[in-house]
């Protein structure tokens, strides 16, 4: 049994880091493998992660982490029984993938303005709480070409757009994702999408 693709990990910079790797053949990850991890720090304790399958030869492990700070560095040991398959390390602050925003809501009752709001996925005492920016994706279910991205570079988790910038009488979907420049993060996953029917009063044409 060998590791084909070494583990790569990303952290949500709050409580979970996710490591993925590939074996050289079909593997029952949860019964055959264990990923041991330990913070390189005074008084820290070793923890064991039981991986799950992620495709035939792929494995994924969700590592629980507390009180994440920039200095944190973890040792990682991948074991198959008594055999050490791989040894490495992981610094969460250097591989951050933010949590996805949640509770995306489209408010359509504001005089021909669409107000999209969502929730910041971090608590106020987490550093990322005040450092997320967002991308909102809106697309038409009827027309694949009607696909747009709005960049939200201010801190407030909301976006206002004129309903008239979208076509009237058809259904749209929206989703939102986040990233943080301060840690040079990757983008989060997209939030679940939400659907609404876009309608607005056409202005009277002047002749």
């Amino acid at each position: 049994m060998k590791v084909l693709q070494e583990p790569t990990c990303v952290s949500d910079y709050m409580s979970i880091s996710t490591c993925e790797w590939k074996m050289n053949g079909p593997t029952n990850c949860s019964t055959e493998l264990r990923l041991l991890y330990q913070l390189v720090f005074l008084l820290s304790e070793a923890h064991t992660c039981i991986p799950e399958n992620n495709g035939g030869a792929g494995c994924v492990c969700h590592l629980l982490m507390d009180d994440v700070v920039s200095a944190d560095n973890y040792t990682l040991d991948l074991w198959a029984g008594q055999q050490l398959l791989w040894k490495g390390s992981f610094k969460p602050s250097e591989h951050v993938k933010p949590r996805a925003p949640g509770n995306l809501t489209v408010h359509t009752n504001v005089s021909d303005t669409l107000l999209l709001t969502w929730s910041n996925p971090y608590p106020p005492d987490n550093y990322l709480y005040n450092h997320l920016t967002y991308a909102v994706n809106i697309w038409s279910e009827n027309d694949p070409a009607d696909f747009r991205i709005y960049n939200v570079t201010y801190l407030e988790p909301s976006l206002r757009i004129a309903a008239s910038t979208l076509k009237s009488g058809i259904s749209y979907r929206a989703r939102v994702r986040a990233w943080a420049q301060c840690y040079n993060t990757t983008w989060s996953e997209w939030s679940p999408s939400t659907k609404w029917h876009n309608s607005y009063r056409e202005p009277f044409e002047q002749h």
Epitope: F41, L43, E45, D66, S70, A71, Y127
Partner: antibody, heavy 116, light 111 residues
């Protein structure tokens, strides 16, 4: 919200011991290390040691080795700092603070006075 | 005696900028991240800056931190009378880190 509530002021005689408590609430108690620091009247902050509430392991500043004991009770989310063989120079305000970087808020402090 | 040295006192007028230095060595500041703590008169210390330059929520952006080599600096702009306090730097000490150490402390007076 996060709170660290410390026990009340103590007056002790030289040679005695004192045990100060710090009750935590508003967060997962075993997820954050707990520090103890002290401040003598008119002096600066002095780090005493740290405890990992998850397993109870401890590390103490060399100055306090053999005189300080830090323990925790996970059932009440409380950490304790006991200092023995007290002398007059141990008169200070003793603080608890959580997390690797002594996050906010700290405990309000416990004044320990050592006087004959 | 702390291994992190700070000036005993600094002063400036309201609205001005003030900086407080924290000088250490390769086994502490040079090999770790620096935090800064503010202690208002009669109160417990409060974390002001961590990881050299990050502010916890609720700390105004008038406070900033930086680190270069074996020394760190806390800067306060737009000084207010309410900023009058003692300021301490702090960092993990040793390789690997085994002790936390506070600086000697600096008394800030707003004139």
């Amino acid at each position: 919200q996060v709170q660290l509530v410390q026990s009340g002021a103590e007056v002790k005689k030289p040679g005695a011991s004192v045990k100060v408590s710090c009750k935590a609430s508003g967060y997962a108690f075993t997820s954050y290390y707990m520090h103890w620091a002290r401040q003598a009247p008119g002096q600066g902050l002095e780090w005493m040691g740290i405890i990992n509430p998850s397993g109870g392991s401890t590390s103490y500043a060399q100055k306090f080795q053999g005189r300080v004991t830090m323990t925790r009770d996970t059932s009440t989310s409380t950490v304790y700092m006991e200092l023995s063989s007290l002398r007059s120079e141990d008169t200070a305000v003793y603080y608890c603070a959580r997390g690797k970087l002594l996050k906010n808020p700290w405990g309000k402090g416990t004044l320990v006075t050592v006087s004959s | 005696q702390s291994v992190l040295t700070q000036p005993p006192s600094v002063s400036a007028a309201p609205g001005q900028k003030v900086t407080i230095s924290c000088s250490g060595g390769s086994s502490n500041i040079g090999n770790s991240y620096v935090s800064w703590y503010q202690q208002l008169p009669g109160t417990a210390p409060k974390l002001l800056i961590y990881d050299n330059n990050k502010r916890p929520s609720g700390i105004p952006d008038r406070f900033s931190g930086s680190k270069s080599g074996t020394s760190a600096t806390l800067a306060i702009t737009g000084l207010q009378t309410g900023d009058e306090a003692d300021y301490y730097c702090g960092t993990w000490f040793g390789t690997p880190a085994s002790n936390y150490v506070f600086g000697t402390g600096t008394k800030l007076t707003v004139l």
